[in-house]
Interface confidence: medium
């Protein structure tokens, strides 16, 4: 219960704080747990006890290991234990999962993601920002204090947010960098009766003979990641693939989120050399969800080639 | 009549990895497949789910990255494979589809397979 578990990067400040809380008038005794042996006080040390605070500066990965801290008052004493681990900077930018402090939501109304751990540090702003290992740059992201403000979240702001700043201790620096996960959750996700925004209602698509033609279904579906929704084609009634006509194929496009939020999905039909009797067919674009099912028909007709030299 | 069987839950301990399958029977055509759950006293919730048309998958952000959703046209099969399991994920695991059945579009759901995740 009174362990606390602490990490951190060789040659970085790193500053673990005794889990058991006293009044700041009681004296606190660090150890270091395999040993017994006492940690120094004095300042000169790279790894010396301040209070309530066992500071590393830097931290080595031989560090590493269970300190003890013993809060110690006129009528008790309380034992507490900082389980220390000091890793190797990796090489690449992935951050492993042991590295990570606790993830953090974020949605359109609140987006503060704050650095982990940064209050028992001496750091003066601006603090820096990654996102992926990536500087974050743009008027949408503002480091404010101790956190990151993300204007606008969208779901593509989602990933592992890296701060770091800079630690002073008697004129010295130290690096310190730390980083959590965020997700975004949709606050206003809703999902709804499909709404066909393409083609129109009983709409006259103009093609071709002997040309290829590309026919669009589009539909929305609701504002947020839309689960089960469908977008497709019918050839008189009759689904494609069993149409049996091999010229007349439909293929998954692009998805799309619309900057009102939509979450859309569109099928494209493709015909390859117009023939006359594919005027003669009805062509239905279908969206379905768990609401149900929205039909817009559309019918082809005949494009008289235009004569440029009339 | 549309069937849709689901398999792969048991209890698995925390960090560990089950896949769910689900199968749809007396369809002629799935259009597009997904895992919901549902823990004790929850909302149901959306896992992930994937078109058959394009294979686009969807996921729930608390799964992504450790669950991946896939599926056999052939078969008319969804796999959900879960990885990284954590206790929160402990649910019912419901399958669902829009599929045509018989000239009729529809969507349906299976009786579910409950996944425990525990030490």
């Known amino acids: 219960k009174f362990s606390k578990q602490s990490w951190g990067l060789e040659n970085e400040a790193l500053i673990v704080r005794c889990p058991r809380q006293g009044k700041p008038s009681y004296t606190v005794d660090w150890y270091y747990s395999q040993t017994n042996k006492s940690i120094p006080t004095q300042e000169r040390n790279r790894v010396f006890a301040s209070g309530q605070l066992l500071k590393f500066l830097p931290a080595a990965v031989a560090d590493s290991g269970i300190y003890t801290c013993i809060v110690r008052s006129p009528t008790f004493n309380r034992t507490g234990y900082a389980n220390v681990t000091i890793y190797k900077k990796q090489s690449d930018c992935n951050v492993p999962d042991y590295l990570m402090y606790s993830t953090v939501s974020g949605s359109e109304k609140n987006s503060k993601i704050y650095c982990p751990t940064i209050d028992l540090y001496n750091w003066t702003a601006p603090l820096e920002w990654f996102k992926n290992c990536q500087a974050l740059q743009g008027s949408r992201y503002r480091a404010h204090k101790s956190f990151l403000v993300i204007d606008n979240v969208m779901t593509e702001d989602a990933g592992d947010y890296t701060c770091k700043f800079i630690h002073n201790e008697n004129g010295a620096n130290y690096s310190v960098t730390a980083t959590r996960s965020f997700t975004v959750k949709d606050e206003q996700g809703f999902s709804l009766f499909p709404v066909i925004g393409a083609p129109a209602q009983n709409e006259i698509k103009e093609v071709e003979i002997g040309k290829n033609a590309n026919l669009t279904c589009s539909a929305c579906f609701g504002k947020g990641t839309q689960f089960l929704a469908a977008v497709l084609w019918q050839l008189n009634g009759t689904k494609i693939t069993d149409f049996g006509e091999p010229r007349i194929q439909q293929e998954e496009g692009q998805n799309q989120s619309f900057s009102n939020g939509l979450a859309c999905l569109d099928m494209v039909l493709r015909i390859a050399d117009v023939k006359e009797e594919d005027l003669l067919l009805q062509y239905d674009c279908l969206a379905l969800n768990l609401h149900g099912l929205r039909r817009h028909t559309v019918r082809l007709s005949r494009k008289n080639p235009i004569d440029h030299h009339s | 009549e549309v069937q849709l069987v689901e398999s792969g839950g048991g209890l698995v301990q925390p960090g560990g990895s089950l896949r769910l399958s689900c199968a749809a029977s007396g369809l002629t055509t799935v259009y597009t497949m997904g895992w919901f759950r549902q823990a004790p006293g929850k909302e149901r919730e959306s896992v992930a789910s994937i078109s058959w048309t394009g294979g686009t998958t969807y996921y729930a952000d608390s799964v992504k990255g450790r669950f991946t959703i896939s599926a056999d046209n052939s078969k008319n099969t969804a796999y959900l494979q879960m990885n990284s399991l954590k206790p929160e994920d402990t649910a019912v695991y419901y399958c669902?589809?829009?599929?045509?059945?018989?000239?009729?579009?529809?969507?349906?759901w299976g009786q579910g397979t409950l996944v425990t995740v525990s030490s």
């Open positions: 669902a589809a829009i599929a045509h059945e018989e000239g009729v579009y529809r969507w349906d």
